[in-house]
């Protein structure tokens, strides 16, 4: 039975030019984790896998960064970077458990953090 | 374009070890995780493990863990995969594949195998 | 390990005709957090290794042509192949992508009636 959840940094807002912080935690589990990728809805940007260690994909490299933790780094940020990033965390004997991430790039100056929320 | 250059047959002998060879050109090989998949007529294609060639990190499928082992060297842009203690068993074709950015287990790009026949 | 098993093991279809692949996974390959299944198809002719034809169970690779769809989700897939051409003889495979181990089915030889 799948008995954790996984916090996310929920809705997000961000300028443009500027870099933010994608994290998700995984708790309520005594599971292991095995890997960790972050996706958007049409391609791999990373994996973090227990034996491998961090992989950024290509496409990204120059302006993803692996970390804080689990967690990743996308920097030079621009319009086109708006939208659903997904956390999934493969786990044993678990097996998959994933969060959603909405960033929004703004133009403005202006750029507030949304809430925490859960996915249970 | 995208080549992965692997020698076409390898004979060995019971018992003996092998070590074969996946030679990458047409994009920068420590950006990409290569796997390893073997090919038997009665158990069908069976993915092996992979390997990050940037870090050396390995990840390997739990059924050949101890006999096979995946190494990289950069400054050649080639993969290894040893095979140890052959048996009858071991007699396939084996491949090397580049994974894909829609996916960490999706191969577009493949060697076109070693035949490796063990026989005394 | 996850288990896909194809269906049938091999298919005779005559040219211009419809041909259809069963696949089906031990478990779900749906994630239901991004509502992406990952399965793949491959297509291997003799002396060859296998060519990505399709992912996220209905994506088309580059190249591919459109008579190869894909369709399913969960644990229920299917390669369709709308007209048969004399070049799509070949063995197909289904994949699980969604775990470790990477599994693939058992393969369905496709020949020409």
């Known amino acids: 039975m799948m008995t954790g959840t996984i916090e996310t940094t929920g809705n997000i807002s961000a300028e443009k030019g500027g870099s933010i912080i994608l994290q998700c935690h995984l708790s309520s589990t005594t599971a292991q984790v095995t890997q960790v990728n972050w996706e958007q809805q049409d391609q791999l940007l990373a994996i973090c896998n227990a034996d491998l260690g961090w992989h950024i994909s290509p496409s990204f490299k120059d302006r993803v960064a692996p970390g804080p933790g689990l967690g990743l780094t996308l920097q030079s940020l621009t319009v086109n970077d708006t939208g659903e990033y997904f956390c999934i965390y493969h786990t044993y004997p678990d097996g998959t458990y994933t969060g959603r991430i909405f960033l929004e790039v703004l133009e403005s100056s202006v750029a507030e953090h949304g809430a925490r929320f859960q996915i249970p | 374009q995208v080549q992965l250059q692997q020698p076409g047959a390898e004979l060995v002998k019971p018992g003996a070890s092998v070590k074969m060879s996946c030679k990458a050109s047409?994009?920068?090989?420590?950006?990409?995780?290569m796997h390893w998949v073997k090919q038997t007529p009665g158990r069908g294609l069976e993915w092996i493990g992979a390997?990050?060639?940037?870090?050396?990190?390995?990840s390997y499928n739990q059924k050949f863990k101890g006999k096979a082992t995946l190494t990289a060297d950069k400054s050649s842009s080639t993969a290894y995969m040893q095979l140890s203690s052959l048996t009858s068993e071991d007699s396939a074709v084996y491949y090397c594949?580049?994974?894909?950015?829609?996916?960490?287990?999706?191969?577009?790009?493949w060697g076109a195998g070693t035949t490796v026949t063990v026989s005394a | 390990d996850i288990v896909m098993t194809q269906s049938p093991d091999s298919l005779a279809v005559s040219l211009g005709e419809r041909a259809t692949i069963n696949c089906k996974s031990s478990?779900?390959?749906?994630?239901?957090?991004?509502?992406?299944?990952?399965l793949a198809w491959y297509q291997q002719k003799p002396g060859q290794p296998p060519k990505l034809l399709i992912y996220?169970?209905?994506t088309r690779e580059s190249g591919v042509p459109d008579r190869f769809s894909g369709s399913g989700s969960g644990t229920d897939f299917t390669l369709t192949i709308s007209s048969l051409q004399a070049e799509d003889v070949a063995v197909y495979y289904c994949?699980?992508?969604?775990?470790?181990?990477?599994?693939f089915g058992g393969g369905t030889k496709l020949e020409i009636k």
């Open positions: 594949a580049r994974y894909h950015y829609y996916g960490s287990g999706l191969f577009p790009y």
């Open positions: 996220g169970a209905s």
């Open positions: 994949q699980n992508y969604h775990s470790y181990p990477f599994t």
């Open positions: 478990q779900s390959l749906l994630n239901s957090g991004n509502q992406k299944n990952y």
């Open positions: 390997i990050n060639p940037g870090s050396g990190g390995t």
């Open positions: 047409g994009y920068a090989f420590t950006d990409y995780l």
